[in-house]
């Protein structure tokens, strides 16, 4: 008995398309191996008409494709546009046609409903409008116009000209009767039901010379489209329903059990927590459409979506609506990386933000996740030199350690930077990650004076004390610019005093600064790195004045003037031009988000990344 | 909610024929995948099989068990779902259940179920 199972029979009509899935038990060998649909001939023969390994049949040319789900064990053939020709018995099967590891599948295709004569037919989608035209001849203008339902062998009256409504209309029907220069009535329904779908008589006056007209109505509800994505990686769901709802309440939700259906984001505000921090719902255009993005997609991610439309934000029966079916594949080509990053106040992180290695030249951004109204995420720093104006001197984007991975370094931080931020790039918009830095109780790790004031022409010293634990990592100062830090020398003066239980492998490490000048005035980090890995970083901002008195600086510890959570650093917002924000690969198909606070920054929307690991502020 | 309701078990000769009803009823606008499953005495539930549908197309599955012998069909109308059994052998002894979701991953595990009936008795006596 073959272990491959699927549907035995597959009964359609016309003009249709049919999604026939076919389940294997999911072996690594199984997984991998080609997956064929073929059309059994009268002699015993099975002719491939799609496999898996790209070969499409001229008879399925534009109409077919085969899509194999290998964590579940599945692949699903999709034919479209069917016809009776297409009627006959079927094999879904692995391996070799002719090898037995395969399924029968009868497929049927009929002409359709057996429709009377002059029956006008009407497809629509589920929550959506109909319109159907009743014409009438002069006779029967002043006479009641009606529209009844079959309903098994009874018309069942829906509505009349005299103002009855169906119990099962309420509210959503009604009877237009045009000027008296048409000879026609309309009956509009909306908020459509699977259960509005049959046959319809619309008539005119109710002798034997009242006009009547046959109408079918096929109500669809939407084929989930199959969305494919990788475990920490990111999906977008578009969502257009049509202009008629372009003011009504947007949501997006997950089917659970039954006709559940729990919001997973609404325009109301609603937003499940298990999204909190990775998901942004796009403003929507004047025709109503919108897109969600779901970033660090997780195994239980997988699943039924619905975006619909209702004044309750939620899914109600009648709601228009769209469908996906996602599935989260485990073997994921994008990278483990940390979810968390803890830092400490007056303390630093880096981050290390995960991009398709294939695309090392696109430029690299980090955005702040915001939960308010549907979610944004303005653009804190980018790969080509701008800084977000609140973020200069403490925040940088390093194409190290490259070959997949940035980094972005943050310090100076404060309880108000705890919050969720998104690495993305103008590339693959699939890599999306997100990180969740975490503000905990402690000290930072390196110790520098607060700010410091650099006299002209003469010679400043700045020390930055490294406790024993950094033994190990190499030491550095830089200069911050909005394009990175550039190293500057410095002298490592030997064993630090600054720590309490610290051997001698602490290090004091000082930034020289000789005849300084007006250029020299700035930010300057302390840090440390193992290679192109980046750790803990301390900042230091320099002033330079006029000469005083003569003689060089030598700053101590002691002299620090504020800690440097406490440096409000007010220098003007650069304007960003909006090419950056409206760069049309930034998102693919996803919208900047922004709103007026902080149009001048250029805000842009960005991404995200899942597992359950953590990341302290000076590891790896 | 939906409620599921089977009808038309009984006591019958093996080589007999029965059909089993399971009629829904409550909001059953989105529920597209019914099925029945059945239990034998002292076994775990197993698939019979499972109808589906989406707009005018219908998606059949059996088990091998009952291939050629057992039939599922609908009356969208009525919200039933029908089990023709044909040939039926001791071993179709068992309580048939009808169970019924708006989406299955596999039509075949119990648990993707999320609605299900009482249950109808079928005993097939040699």
């Known amino acids: 008995k073959s272990p491959i199972f699927g549907p035995e029979e597959v009964n359609s009509v016309e003009g249709n398309s049919v999604s026939i899935t076919c389940y294997y038990p999911p072996t690594s060998v199984n997984r991998h191996t080609r997956k064929y649909w073929c059309r059994q001939g009268a002699r015993g023969g099975c002719i491939t008409l799609i496999s898996s390994e790209g070969y499409v049949s001229s008879k399925y040319a534009g109409r077919a494709n085969l899509t194999n789900f290998p964590e579940n064990g599945t692949f699903v053939v999709n034919i479209a546009q069917l016809s009776q020709d297409d009627s006959g018995r079927y094999k879904c099967g692995l391996g070799i046609n002719s090898r037995g590891l395969s399924f029968d599948v009868s497929l049927e295709v009929s002409q359709g409903p057996g429709l009377l004569n002059d029956t006008k037919v009407y497809t629509v989608d589920l929550g959506r409008t109909v319109t159907i035209n009743c014409p009438f001849k002069t006779e029967n203008a002043q006479k009641r116009k009606s529209l009844y339902k079959q309903i098994g062998l009874y018309p069942v009256l829906v509505i009349d000209s005299s103002g009855y409504v169906n119990p099962n209309y309420t509210g959503r029907i009604r009877l237009d009767i045009q000027g008296t220069g048409q000879l026609l009535f309309s009956v509009v329904i909306n908020q459509l039901r699977l259960s509005d779908a049959g046959q319809y008589l619309c008539q005119a006056g109710d002798d034997s010379n009242s006009n009547k007209k046959n109408a079918d109505l096929q109500v669809l509800k939407p084929e989930p489209e199959l969305v494919y994505e990788d475990l920490r990686g990111s999906v977008t769901f578009h969502c257009a329903l049509g202009p008629e709802v372009a003011n009504v309440a947007k949501f997006l939700c997950r089917q659970s059990s039954g006709e559940n259906c729990d919001v997973v984001v609404n325009t109301l505000g609603k937003r499940a927590p298990a999204f909190e921090g990775r998901i942004l719902l796009n403003p929507q255009d004047k025709d109503g459409s919108f897109s969600v993005v779901i970033t660090g997609l997780r195994k239980e991610d997988a699943g039924r979506y619905l975006c619909g439309a209702h004044s309750d934000g939620q899914l109600q029966e009648g709601s228009p609506i769209q469908a996906w079916q996602l599935f989260v594949n485990e073997e994921s080509t994008i990278p483990r990386s940390p979810t968390v990053v803890k830092g400490v106040a007056g303390g630093s992180v880096a981050v290390l933000c995960p991009y398709n290695r294939k695309e090392s030249k696109s430029i690299k951004y980090w955005c702040l996740w915001e939960g308010a109204q549907n979610g944004r995420c303005p653009l804190l720093v980018d790969s080509e030199g701008w800084v977000k104006a609140q973020y200069e001197g403490r925040l940088s984007l390093l194409e190290e350690p490259g070959n997949g991975t940035f980094t972005v370094i943050l310090n100076q931080l404060t309880s108000r930077d705890a919050g969720f931020y998104w690495c993305l790039t103008n590339g693959d918009t699939l890599w999306r990650t997100t990180v969740e830095i975490k503000i905990i109780e402690g000290e930072p790790n390196l110790k520098v004076p607060g700010n410091v004031t650099a006299v002209l022409g003469e010679t400043l010293k700045v020390p930055c004390h490294f406790p024993c634990k950094f033994s190990s990592y190499e030491k550095y100062w830089c200069k911050w610019n909005n394009t990175g830090c550039q190293a500057l020398p410095s002298q490592d003066e030997g064993p630090s005093k600054a720590f309490v239980n610290c051997d001698e492998n602490s290090r004091l490490v000082s930034l020289t600064l000789n005849l300084v000048t007006r250029a020299d005035e700035g930010w300057y980090w302390c840090g440390v790195k193992q290679g192109h890995f980046y750790g803990e970083t301390a900042a230091v901002y320099v002033a330079v004045e006029e000469r005083k008195a003569a003689g060089s600086r030598d700053v101590s510890l002691a002299k620090a003037d504020a800690a440097p959570d406490e440096k409000v650093l007010d220098s003007g917002f650069r304007e960003i031009e909006n090419k950056a924000i409206q760069d049309p690969r930034l998102f693919a198909e996803e919208k900047a988000v922004a709103d007026t606070r902080d149009q001048a920054d250029g805000s842009r929307a960005s991404v995200d990344s899942g597992s359950s690991e953590e990341q302290g502020g000076s590891s790896r | 909610q939906v409620q599921l309701v089977e009808s038309g078990g009984g006591l019958v000769q093996a080589g007999d024929s029965l059909r089993l009803s399971c009629a829904a009823s409550?909001?059953?606008?989105?529920?597209?995948?019914m099925g029945w499953f059945r239990q034998p005495p002292g076994k775990e539930r197993e698939f019979v099989a499972t109808?589906?549908?989406?707009?005018?197309?219908?998606?059949?599955y059996y088990a091998d068990s009952v291939k050629g012998r057992f039939t599922i069909s609908r009356d969208n109308a009525k919200n039933t779902v029908y089990l023709q059994m044909n040939s039926l052998k001791p071993e179709d002894t068992a309580v048939y259940y009808c169970a019924a979701s708006t989406v299955v991953a596999d039509p075949r595990a119990p648990n993707e179920y999320d609605y299900w009936g009482q249950g109808t008795q079928v005993t097939v006596s040699s």
């Open positions: 109808i589906s549908w989406s707009g005018s197309t219908t998606y059949k």
């Open positions: 409550g909001r059953t606008f989105t529920t597209y995948v």
